[in-house]
Interface confidence: low
């Protein structure tokens, strides 16, 4: 909340759009907006009409550089808007940048997503820590047809204005936290040196050599991913990661999808009957995938299924007897992940050394 | 904490090139927007320009613009930024860092140690 917790002392707030923006047509803007303005009375008893001429509570403009406020944007990127604390005046007012490049798809910058989060600053909110949070100060692309506000910022508009007065309580999307006891990955595979975990519409990076970890959206990597993977996997030798949902599957080079995906698993050689793959990992030319308890064994040379597969997972790897839900490699070590657990198995000793929980991967102790 | 290293500094006479560069020995750059900085003695440290993860998009400070060029080539995870016209008034330490674009404006970590670049006559 922001300090001294300005409010608006009524409920049913009025905004004028001011001016708009080359990019996007007048009605484009108008239902970002209005779409913008929907994400925080749903979740509050505010409401919000647009009117036409005279004095509105919020009004809305796109400005450039220097435009009377001592607060000057500066150009392409940087800054992209800002909005002022509620109040009389230019209280509660949001500025755009009107150099920014502004859209209504994944391209930088989405004017839904910056409007909602500058109009959570026109209600009285400042930033929050939460990355998955709206009002995280970090831009990041969100699907918009699908978007629903996270439950940290139903939390803080409801604080200043209370509950919403649907008589069904909204309650939105909770940023997984790396030290629950009871996380479990959807998804695991390295890239370039470092180490991703999959989770819902999020990933944990982790840098090798630091340890850092840090919280993303897929969206904002790679927007033209699904959210929900199940299975991903680095081939090394070809310096491409493979992404898995359903029969479905993407490939990337670094942080760039790679032309004619997302095809289907059955170019591996998967009958019908797969649905969808748990887990997958590569190592020395082969590409092992985990379904059900059962795994399958890929030639990346010959581009075709190893006869004889698949095997049931223990009589391959004697100590994994569960279901795999993620799997990546690190030195000589199966990094399988089951639950809120993982089991490291060294494929030179061929047991596995080691079984401790997962989040361990993300710094908790 | 990822350990930038600037390069390129040096003294220079007014209206001089200097080239910077930037790099992160065994930590890849090539998906993060990384901007130069500058802090001159007894001032705030303020951002030159920064550039986007891709090259494609790119931003400059005003007293900057059409003398200094920002680049990057991800092949040799390096971030470069070309001065030309230099005047005594770009004297300062040149910091590279990753610059994340927000809704407020630009923040920044992972802060190299500087190089230091000279505009006199």
């Known amino acids: 909340l922001t300090p001294g917790s300005p409010k608006w002392t009524h409920t049913n707030l009025t905004y004028r759009i001011i001016n708009h923006t080359p990019q996007l047509s007048r009605a484009e803007v108008k239902t970002a907006i209005e779409k913008a303005f929907h994400v925080w009375s749903v979740a509050s008893p505010l409401t919000f009409t647009e009117i036409l001429q005279g004095e509105a509570d919020i009004n809305i403009a796109f400005v450039s550089r220097d435009h009377g406020d001592n607060s000057p944007f500066d150009g392409p990127n940087g800054i992209l808007a800002h909005a002022f604390q509620p109040g009389q005046g230019i209280g509660g007012d949001a500025h755009f940048d009107s150099e920014e490049t502004w859209t209504q798809d994944s391209k930088n910058y989405n004017l839904f997503l910056v409007a909602a989060h500058e109009f959570g600053h026109s209600l009285g909110l400042s930033h929050s820590t939460d990355p998955g949070a709206l009002m995280y100060p970090n831009y990041a692309y969100r699907e918009p047809s699908t978007y629903s506000l996270p439950q940290d910022d139903i939390n803080g508009i409801q604080t200043i204005y209370g509950p919403s007065d649907n008589p069904i309580q909204p309650t939105g999307p909770s940023t997984p936290k790396a030290c629950d006891p009871h996380l479990r990955f959807d998804a695991t595979t390295t890239l370039r040196g470092e180490i991703y975990f999959f989770k819902d519409k999020y990933f944990w990076r982790r840098h090798p050599q630091l340890r850092t970890v840090d919280l993303n959206f897929i969206s904002l990597f790679w927007p033209f991913l699904p959210n929900g993977l199940q299975a991903a996997y680095e081939d090394f030798d070809r310096d491409l990661v493979f992404l898995f949902k359903g029969r479905q599957y993407w490939a990337l080079s670094g942080y760039d999808l790679q032309q004619g995906y997302p095809r289907d698993i059955s170019n591996y050689g998967f009958p019908r009957s797969v649905q969808a793959i748990d887990a997958a990992v590569s190592y020395n030319g082969k590409t092992y995938f985990f379904i059900n308890n059962q795994c399958w064994r890929y030639d990346n040379q010959r581009r075709s299924m190893d006869p004889g597969y698949p095997k049931s997972i223990p009589s391959m790897f004697p100590g994994v007897n569960c279901r795999v839900d993620a799997v990546f490699l690190q030195d000589s070590f199966f990094l399988f992940f089951s639950g809120p657990q993982y089991f490291a198995f060294n494929f030179v000793s061929h047991r596995v050394t080691r079984v401790a929980r997962s989040n361990l991967w993300l710094n908790c102790s | 904490q990822v350990q930038l290293q600037e390069s390129g500094g040096g003294l220079v006479q007014p209206g001089g090139s200097l080239r910077l560069s930037c790099t992160a020995p065994?930590?890849?750059?090539?998906?993060?927007?990384i901007g130069w900085f500058r802090q001159a003695p007894g001032k705030e440290r303020e951002r030159v320009s920064c550039?986007?993860?891709?090259?494609?998009?790119?931003n400059y400070a005003d007293s900057v613009k059409g003398r200094f060029t920002i680049s990057r080539d991800n092949a040799k995870n390096t971030v470069y930024l070309q001065m030309n016209s230099l005047k005594p008034e770009d004297t300062g330490v040149y910091y590279c860092?990753?610059?994340?674009?927000?809704?407020?404006?630009?923040?920044?970590?992972?802060w190299g140690q500087g190089t230091q670049v000279t505009v006199s006559s």
């Open positions: 860092a990753h610059c994340m674009a927000t809704t407020e404006g630009y923040e920044y970590d992972y």
């Open positions: 065994g930590f890849t750059l090539d998906y993060y927007n």
């Open positions: 550039i986007s993860s891709s090259g494609g998009s790119t």
